[in-house]
């Protein structure tokens, strides 16, 4: 009982060291504004959580859209 | 929130002009800056913007002498401009370029401007 | 290159009147355009983006229209207030541009 306390606890202290959980820690969304469609072509590059770099954050919005899918943005620049 | 240019000021032909750009209440990784001039008496003219992710882009009149970099621990972007002549005279301004990706993109937020004249 | 093209240069109505300034791209900007004031010795106030959406604060008597190629402002019961320079500026693209803004159009109050 008392090892598993100490294991418990630790995994506890581990989990709260690590930071935010979930999705936060993922990516952020990709801002997406439904009454006002279309992207424009300046490349500003995000990288994706799939791995991808999309060349601008609505790129990656509409392509959410269109593969119904939910990929984060995990870092601003190209992955 | 807000933008201001550094000071300005009296530059010879030739000189390097380099105005500083900083930024209050608003983090450099998640917006675009833009730098805008406007000679005495004439209309606005774009010089570059720097976006979210770093990349400058330039006019291209501006390409060959212009330099647009940004450190965003200190929240400033910086414009440095060669090989400046008597046409490079102008009020310069920083403003913050919101969503660059989107068709929404529009500079919301402007500094008051500063002066650069170049003479010998 | 995505050059921008304002009409007219100047333009003076009778206060309550309607001003109507006219902004032509070279190429397809879809709706990525930006309408500003200007007043002399003041940084240029952001009015409409989007080609048609109101920024903050700015009264509902200017109005955008446009897409594509054409777009228009619109400043109905004018006021000595709107006595200003007047400028377009696309946000579509930064590649290859001479200039993102319009030459400006100098709207005058009678």
């Known amino acids: 009982m008392k090892v598993t306390g100490i294991f418990l606890l630790s995994a506890l202290a581990l989990l709260s060291l690590s930071g935010n959980t979930g999705a936060d820690s993922l990516g952020r969304e990709a801002k997406c504004y439904n009454e006002l469609n279309g992207c424009t072509k300046i490349y500003d590059p995000v990288c994706g959580t799939d791995g991808n770099t999309y060349p601008n954050e609505c790129v990656l919005c509409f392509e959410n859209r269109k593969r119904q899918t939910s990929i984060l943005i995990q870092k601003s620049g190209p992955c | 929130q807000s933008v201001k240019e550094s000071e300005g000021g009296l530059f010879k032909p030739t000189d390097t002009l380099t105005l500083t750009c900083t930024v209050s209440?608003?983090?450099?990784?998640?917006?675009?800056i833009g730098w805008v001039r406007q000679a005495p008496g004439n209309g606005l003219e774009w010089i570059g913007t720097?976006?979210?992710?770093?990349?400058?882009y330039y006019a291209n009149w501006a390409k060959s002498r212009s330099t647009i970099t940004r450190n965003t621990n200190l929240n400033t972007v910086t414009l440095k401009m060669t090989s400046l002549t008597a046409a490079d005279t102008a009020t310069y301004f920083c403003?913050?370029?919101?969503?660059?990706?989107?068709?929404?993109?529009?500079?919301?937020?402007w500094g008051q401007g500063t002066l650069v004249t170049v003479s010998s | 290159a995505y050059d921008m093209t304002q009409t007219p240069a100047s333009v003076s109505e009778p206060v309550r009147g309607t001003v109507t300034i006219k902004c032509q791209a070279s190429?397809?900007?879809?709706?990525?355009l930006a309408w500003y004031q200007q007043k002399p010795g003041q940084p240029p106030k952001l009015l409409i983006y989007?080609?048609?959406y109101l920024a903050s604060g700015v009264p509902s008597r200017f109005s955008g229209s446009g897409s594509g190629t054409e777009f228009t402002l619109t400043i109905s019961d004018l006021e000595c207030a709107d006595a200003a320079t007047y400028y377009c500026?696309?946000?579509?693209?930064?590649?290859?541009?001479?200039?993102?803004f319009g030459g400006g159009t100098e709207g005058g109050v009678k």
């Open positions: 989007a080609a048609s």
């Open positions: 500026h696309q946000g579509y693209s930064a590649s290859n541009v001479d200039n993102t």
């Open positions: 190429q397809s900007i879809s709706t990525a």
């Open positions: 209440g608003f983090s450099l990784s998640s917006y675009a």
């Open positions: 720097i976006v979210t992710s770093g990349i400058p």
């Open positions: 403003a913050r370029n919101l969503d660059p990706a989107y068709s929404t993109t529009r500079l919301d937020l």
